[in-house]
């Protein structure tokens, strides 16, 4: 029976945090950073943050953008600072051109 390999401590990254889930914090620490855009009753809601555990974001980050949600993930300190997720557009970008950042 093969010995189980010792688990290495995963690298944690500092991420920009923006949106409802951040409370009063403007950053968080996790194994992946993300920037997301979703639609809430006609408003586009942008959020940024981190996945504490890699598996937590594994499926989310692999999901291709849809008309209702887009998530971009990255690994690296503050790597989501200048990432703004965008919904896919077909030709002319109307009417997917509104965004609303919930604090």
């Amino acid at each position: 029976m093969e010995d189980e390999k010792p688990k290495v401590n995963p690298k944690l990254y500092m991420c920009v945090c923006e949106g409802l889930s951040c409370g009063n914090e403007d950053h968080c620490e996790g194994q992946q950073c993300f920037s997301s855009l979703s639609i809430n009753d006609g408003f586009h809601v942008y959020q940024k943050g981190c996945f504490q555990v890699y598996e937590q974001g594994k499926m989310t980050c692999k999901t291709p953008p849809s008309p209702g949600q887009a998530v971009e993930c990255c690994q690296g300190d503050w790597c989501n600072r200048n990432i703004t997720a965008q919904l896919p557009t077909k030709g002319k970008s109307f009417p997917g051109t509104q965004n609303f950042h919930l604090e």
Epitope: H44, Q98, H101
Partner: antibody
Framework: EVQLVESGGGLVQPGGSLRLSCAAS????????MSWVRQAPGKGLEWVSA????????YYADSVKGRFTISRDNSKNTLYLQMKSLRVEDTAVYYC?????????WGQGTLVTVSS | DIQMTQSPSSLSASVGDRVTITCRAS??????LNWYQQKPGKAPKLLIY???SLQSGVPSRFSGSGSGTDFTLTISSLQPEDFATYYC??????????FGQGTRLEIK
């Protein structure tokens, strides 16, 4: 073709009321948030009010809070702005626009003049 | 409320010039900054959204950059149809949504 057409503007005395309408076509109106933005003669742009796609959430600039009411009728693809207790400083071209954040497209505007 | 300050308030330039307009936010707004062009008697037109994304149909001579509090709109080679008033607008915070005071671009 996506189109927004405002109507209902005109001359009104201070203290008076007016209701603006914005007829939308060319897109699924109920899916999108909408806003009113105004521009006083020779001045810049001022956001006035916004409403969510369902009409369940509304937002107002402090300058119009308590006097203006935004609403929508998704069955008629129409956005409204009910304006009461109008003041001279409300004189402006009023535009409706898709979304409460980056605005696109815009209507052609309707002029509201508040004067005695 | 987040205040938006544009500079200059007006400028004169010639066809072919490279022009830069700046917009400063009173607090960090990440990249939630949009730019509009308005010609006299007309409704504003969206040029740039999310600081640097060019709106569909807008000529590539227009570009936007910046993040945090400082942003710029650049017109690489001014064309006669570009003489207009330009506005920045933040979409970071929940309402009120705020615009800059505008920059009037005139022919020299």
């Amino acid at each position: 073709e996506v189109q927004l057409v405002e109507s209902g503007g005109g001359l009104v005395q201070p203290g008076g009321s007016l209701r603006l309408s914005c007829a939308a076509s060319g897109f699924t109106f109920s899916t999108y948030a909408m806003s009113w933005v105004r521009q006083a003669p020779g001045k810049g742009l001022e956001w006035v009010s916004a409403i969510s796609g369902s009409g369940g959430s509304t937002y107002y600039a402090d300058s119009v809070k308590g006097r203006f009411t935004i609403s929508r009728d998704n069955s008629k693809n129409t956005l409204y702005l009910q304006m009461k207790s109008l003041r001279v400083e409300d004189t402006a071209v009023y535009y409706c626009a898709n979304s409460p954040s980056w605005f696109d497209p815009w209507g052609q505007g309707t002029l509201v003049t508040v004067s005695s | 409320d987040i205040q938006m300050t544009q500079s200059p308030s007006s400028l004169s330039a010639s066809v072919g010039d490279r022009v830069t307009i700046t917009c400063r936010a009173s607090q960090s707004i990440s990249s939630y900054l949009n730019w509009y062009q308005q010609k006299p008697g007309k409704a504003p037109k969206l040029l740039i959204y999310a600081a640097s994304s060019l709106q569909s149909g807008v000529p590539s001579r227009f570009s936007g950059s910046g993040s945090g509090t400082d942003f710029t709109l650049t017109i690489s080679s001014l064309q006669p149809e570009d003489f207009a008033t330009y506005y920045c607008q933040q979409s970071y915070s929940t309402p009120p949504i705020t615009f800059g005071q505008g920059t009037r671009l005139e022919i020299k």
